[in-house]
Amino acid sequence: QSSERRVVAHMPGDIIIGALFSVHHQPTVDKVHERKCGAVREQYGIQRVEAMLHTLERINSDPTLLPNITLGCEIRDSCWHSAVALEQSIEFIRDSLISSEEEEGLVRCVDGSSSSFRSKKPIVGVIGPGSSSVAIQVQNLLQLFNIPQIAYSATSMDLSDKTLFKYFMRVVPSDAQQARAMVDIVKRYNWTYVSAVHTEGNYGESGMEAFKDMSAKEGICIAHSYKIYSNAGEQSFDKLLKKLTSHLPKARVVACFCEGMTVRGLLMAMRRLGLAGEFLLLGSDGWADRYDVTDGYQREAVGGITIKLQSPDVKWFDDYYLKLRPETNHRNPWFQEFWQHRFQCRLEGFPQENSKYNKTCNSSLTLKTHHVQDSKMGFVINAIYSMAYGLHNMQMSLCPGYAGLCDAMKPIDGRKLLESLMKTNFTGVSGDTILFDENGDSPGRYEIMNFKEMGKDYFDYINVGSWDNGELKMDDDEVWSKKSNIIRSVCSEPCEKGQIKVIRKGEVSCCWTCTPCKENEYVFDEYTCKACQLGSWPTDDLTGCDLIPVQYLRWGDPEP
């Protein structure tokens, strides 16, 4: 999977929707220059490809939605990497340009003769990609050509700015909301001193910026803030972990506004350095309840509290997906590669046979084994439906009383489609209302997850709360079996009576040493001792001064 030859999944139709999914992991640091992608992904890749193909089948067989119009698609692999996604987006654009030139009769062969060649249909809109950084790059290109983009998991706050990203919309909320949710969790458990880590790139950077701003307003201190690339090498992760340990035992909580693979890198480093149980990770929705993040490193992840976008499993997707087999699934060009990777065997005799596996896949293999649906499946499907409803509303207004594509709709005008999409309002796959605000954002509801040891060597994510519209609800008993088990993450303990906080130069406001006031001083505020005026003395609680009662000495009084 390198830059020379990219695989594409096609489904024919009257209108073609583009999609960018991370079918493969991003290139490792040493392979970035050749844009050589990593291993195939199931949840973020294959499942999303299949969701697109099957959702379009459902839309096309729904007589009430886009009657007499067939939706098709062109699915490309973003590899969760900007350079790859841009390269793929250029292919989408190229299709559009060739098609529009053809409409104007501009297609000419090299020798100057006219061409009877029918090019591919233009892409009217794009679903995805998943990553915010990648989505920004793709949007910068797509908006030049008025191609609307609907994201299913790009949550960066920057994308709300319509002056910069006019053709961008999303069926997920902005990260400002989950940053607030994370701060609310930190506040709830009185963690006033935490370390912070974020993934290099827009998602992590803007999310962590919001977390830090909100934390400061709430009196929460950040011991230190670190950033790291998701595809950083072992050494980089080890170095980061060593830095985090330098803030122990005070900053035990690590707030991680991270992509899932960054969290995995941290867990792996914890294993290498023997640091399991030293930290409590508070993770953003990049981690959520993903098993591909914790697999093999459950001990290191135990106790982790994560934010997950609320999205129930989609039953009809599983009914379709779990029946798929490599010998019959020919429309997904990555499926055979995935099957071999998933079951660690080779599809002997097939063109995509992977000889790195010795064992031949047998016919009893099934996707039902250890199946986990992509946690963002509902959003992926809602994004596809949004595009369909937007096109449907556009058809209704441009082609009244006409079933199918009328001339007024040909070729599809991206500006009009965007207008129509922004007004879209329908019931989503989980029964929730899908609509877009003036920034193209959707409202947000989160679930709070806790990664726990459920039994001997059995670990799982448990729903321990929710955050909805600014209100945090947590089942504290589920997270902490006893109050005394609540982890402490504070820099300094409160000062005793008659002591003030002395903050050393260059230290954050949550770290202090407690110093007692002098004998004649009282605690004026938490940082200042003040001497009592002549004739007065500190009160017993040392919070003020009382006048010293005047005592007159008489002859005969004993010496004091």
Epitope: T328, E348, G349, P351, K359, T360, N362
Partner: antibody
Framework: QRQLEESGGGLVKPGGALTLTCKAS?????????ICWVRQAPGKGLEWIAC???????TYYATWAEGRFTSSKTSSTTVTLQMTSLTAADTATYFC?????????????WGQGTLVTVSS | DIVMTQTPASVEAAVGGTVTIKCQAS??????LAWYQQKPGQPPKLLIY???TLESGVPSRFKGSGSGTEFTLTISDLECADAATYYC???????????FGGGTEVVVK
Amino acid sequence: QRQLEESGGGLVKPGGALTLTCKASGIDFSSYYYICWVRQAPGKGLEWIACIYAGDGTTYYATWAEGRFTSSKTSSTTVTLQMTSLTAADTATYFCARGSGVGSYGYNLWGQGTLVTVSS
Amino acid sequence: DIVMTQTPASVEAAVGGTVTIKCQASEYIYSNLAWYQQKPGQPPKLLIYRASTLESGVPSRFKGSGSGTEFTLTISDLECADAATYYCQGYFPSIITNAFGGGTEVVVK
């Protein structure tokens, strides 16, 4: 000298059972090899029965052989084929052969075969 | 049902001549075809696998071609030692099974 040798053939009554053994010498059935069973009725052509992956003992059978024939790896140099409910149609020379897959690479090492006769 | 149809059943050619044997798969099998030579009282010997790859030690006079459902084995510069029965073996990846052709007897005059 790398070779495979089959044993266990002989005369068996209809409805009876028999276990054939394939023993390797000069090689062991290391994890990337497949040991397959092929039979040939007297004067007739070849017929594929089954394969076993030496790595973990996963088996692959011809549809007609499923249930009646069972292949297992009993050591690093031996594989067996258990045959039950035998009929006259099962009379044949049984070969074991080694390949790099169930079939797409062919079988590059064969035993001399062992004759099984099913008769009352 | 999966079947490998091999033709002809028997062919006769002179020393130095050329023989062509055809094999047809009942289903698309990509390049999953092997050719064997078997002499009386001996086990089969692998000549070609993956439709056209010559097994080591096999003379280049043996040539395999074809893909999908139609395959051919060509033996040129026939020698007396080439007199034998030749079998094709098709591997059907979609059902993970094998089938052999009925065999072709080559007689060298």
